[in-house]
């Protein structure tokens, strides 16, 4: 049965040029985190960071995607194109993938709005395949 | 330059332990990077068997958990592929393969040339 | 267990033709797949990662395209070398599986 919930930041925002951290968590479930993924609302992959083998951040985004902190993705270089949905997928053994999903909204330097995940809230998702 | 070689035995008797060898030259299997196991059935089908990583840890695909071990002599910078309670269903061309993943993701990129294993009584 | 499924085993062709080798994931992998080519007697070798970028040294004859479920590998123009099996390879999840191959046979 699957006990666990993902926690995200939700939706956040952050200004054209700037960076955000993008973060999930999963508790309430004592499964092994084995890898997780971090996807773009368009089917591209970001990152893998395998529990064992590390990071693998995608070809594409090489120049601006760092991992972490953590189990997490800092977004680098922000473009308006970056608005939109993320999602984190967690595979974890015995429970199977939980998915937590976050909504950036890049903004005009000039306007307002929070730098780095201002203004941002928590929720609670969670998915199995 | 990356080598991998695999040795062992031509021919093994079901029931028994399949042991081989991956002799890797142009690089220390402890300085980085994972190192697998990948057989190929007859029919060409490929399947992961297994890994070691540079750390020492393991990890084993769940359908030969109860029968599979892969470990390491650092010093003579081999790693190796046990696998029990073997049956003719085993019989494979049998590589060993390097792993690169912070650059290719789960892709492998540089591969032994392969032996062939027959389990046959 | 994710399972890849190349529906084709062969495929005939000519030299200087352009060819398609399709790759079918049976869950979404965004674009985690691999492409390698063995040739007779030999181990396979990577020509693509992450769905469509070139290995080392691989010829821009050989490409890789698509994302999700649907794969695809193509070679522009067909040289008589390109006689092997290809294969596709997902690492969207963690327990990495192949397709069943395609081999190319050149007429």
């Known amino acids: 049965m699957m006990t666990g919930t993902i926690e995200t930041t939700g939706n956040i925002s952050a200004k054209k040029g700037g960076s955000v951290i993008l973060q999930c968590h999963l508790s309430s479930t004592m499964a092994q985190v084995t890898q997780v993924n971090w996807e773009q609302h368009d089917h591209s992959l970001l990152a893998i960071r395998n529990a064992e083998l590390g990071w693998h951040i995608y070809p594409a985004f090489k120049d601006r995607v760092a991992p972490g902190p953590g189990l997490g993705l800092t977004l680098q270089s922000l473009t308006m194109n970056d608005t939109g949905e993320y999602f984190c997928t967690y595979h974890t053994y015995p429970d199977g993938t939980y998915r937590g999903r976050i909504f950036l909204e890049v903004l005009e330097s000039s306007g307002g709005g929070g730098a780095g995940g201002g203004g941002h809230h928590h929720h609670h998702h969670h998915h199995h395949h | 330059d990356v080598q991998l070689q695999e040795s062992g035995p031509d021919l093994v008797k079901p029931s028994q332990s399949l042991s081989l060898t991956c002799t890797v030259t142009?690089?220390?299997?402890?300085?980085?990077?994972?190192w697998h196991w990948i057989r190929q059935f007859p029919g060409n089908k490929l399947d992961w068997m297994g890994y070691v990583h540079y750390s020492g840890s393991t990890n084993y695909n769940p359908s030969l958990k109860s029968r599979i071990s892969i470990t390491r002599d650092t010093s003579k910078n081999q790693f190796f592929l046990q696998l029990n309670s073997v049956t003719t269903e085993d019989t494979a061309t049998f590589y060993c393969?390097?792993?690169?993943?912070?650059?290719?993701?789960?892709?492998?990129?540089?591969w032994g040339q392969g032996t062939s294993v027959t389990v046959s009584s | 267990e994710i399972v890849m499924t190349q529906s084709h085993k062969f495929m005939s062709t000519s030299v200087g033709d352009r060819v398609s080798i399709t790759c079918k994931a049976s869950q979404d992998v965004r674009t985690a797949v691999a492409w390698y080519q063995q040739k007779p007697g030999q181990s396979p070798k990577l020509l693509i990662y992450?769905?469509?970028y070139r290995y080392t040294g691989v010829p821009d004859r050989f490409t890789g395209s698509g994302s999700g479920t649907d794969f695809t590998f193509t070679i522009s123009s067909v040289q008589a070398e390109d006689l092997a099996v290809y294969y596709c390879?997902?690492?969207?999840?963690?327990?990495?599986?192949f397709g069943g191959g395609t081999k190319l046979e050149i007429k």
């Open positions: 393969a390097r792993m690169d993943y912070g650059n290719y993701g789960g892709a492998m990129d540089y």
């Open positions: 142009g690089y220390s299997i402890t300085s980085g990077y994972s």
């Open positions: 390879q997902q690492y969207y999840s963690t327990q990495w599986t």
């Open positions: 992450s769905a469509s």
